[in-house]
């Protein structure tokens, strides 16, 4: 088992909103849970966009999840990652 590296980034979306993206890379096997949580609770599926789990050329895999949130609310959100029985949480950088 190879655990993922997780990276959270933010980008401007429409006025007053930002898109936060959580990327996981370098993991094996390919099964992974990646999702956004607000105030500790998972967001509904229809408010998130997922990328496919793709090979990254090193025998490991990569994927991403993104959601749009209100600017100024970033600290309420965390990216939640689960892989091979382990989990981690990743906040949005300021």
């Amino acid at each position: 088992t190879v655990p993922p590296m997780v990276n959270v980034t933010r980008s401007e979306a429409s006025e007053g909103n930002i898109t936060v993206t959580c990327r996981a890379s370098g993991f094996y096997p390919w099964n992974i849970t990646l999702s956004w949580r607000q105030d500790g609770v998972s967001l509904s599926h229809d408010t998130q966009q997922w990328g496919d789990v793709l090979p990254d050329g090193n025998g490991t895999y990569q994927t991403w999840v993104a959601t749009r949130i209100c600017q100024g609310e970033e600290q309420r959100f965390t990216c939640y990652m689960e892989h091979s029985g382990n989990h981690s949480t990743h906040p949005v950088p300021s």
Partner: antibody
């Protein structure tokens, strides 16, 4: 009202194991991570690890990884911390807490574990 | 691991005094900082989260500030029930780490 109620005090001999429970009520147990923290007598606080009760996935402090097991029973809304190969330095109050996004909003009352020969 | 250095370790103050406690992180924690109050024999009580947001039911005499690596908890007018130990905690990355605590005693 959110409540985390922990099991009672324990006295253990060096080398033994201890299992502390944390029963949650007043909220959806599987929705939030449960964290474990300890505090040695007169000392600061130390994060041990966490569990997602919905999936059983865990996240451990490397310092404790070889000796700690965190589990959860969704049928009773109870999380458990098991610490093995106890030594005197493990004498501490052990707390569970609910992870609300990016802070701990509710804490259990604490369980004193005393390790003494 | 991110180290949290809290100061002072203890202080003596009188009712009505303004009290300031500081917490310095060994790296940027992006304001993911909480402050807790703990009284003897009790579990920690959340006071402030996200560096400056007051938890529900916490009196307005408490305030938090800071960014990057340096953070402050201020009690504008110390009350008798505020004599306790205060801890900071970072949530930027695991292992989540705590300051060593500041004991606020009666002068």
């Amino acid at each position: 009202e959110v409540q985390l109620v922990q099991s009672g005090a324990e006295v253990k001999k060096p080398g033994a194991s201890v299992k502390v429970s944390c029963k949650a009520s007043g909220y959806a147990f599987t929705n939030y991570l449960i964290e474990w923290v300890r505090q040695a007598p007169g000392q600061g606080l130390e994060w041990i690890g966490a569990i997602n009760p919905g999936s059983g996935a865990t996240n451990y402090n490397e310092k404790f990884k070889d000796r700690v097991t965190i589990t959860a029973d969704t049928s009773t809304s109870t999380a458990y911390l098991e610490l093995s190969s106890l030594r005197s330095e493990d004498t501490a109050v052990y707390y569970c807490a609910r992870f609300l996004g990016n802070y701990f909003d509710n804490w259990g009352q604490g369980t004193l574990v005393t390790v003494s020969s | 691991d991110i180290q949290m250095t809290q100061s002072p370790s203890s202080l003596s103050a009188s009712v009505g005094d303004r009290v300031t406690i500081t917490c310095r992180a060994s790296g940027n924690i992006h304001s993911y900082l909480a402050w807790y109050q703990q009284k003897p024999g009790k579990s920690p009580k959340l006071l402030v989260y996200y560096a400056e947001t007051l938890a529900d039911g916490v009196p307005s005499r408490f305030s938090g500030s800071g960014s990057g690596t340096d953070y402050t908890l201020t009690i504008s007018s110390l009350q008798p029930e505020d004599f306790a130990t205060y801890f900071c905690q970072q949530f930027w990355t695991t292992p989540y780490t705590f300051g060593q605590g500041t004991k606020v005693e009666i002068k």
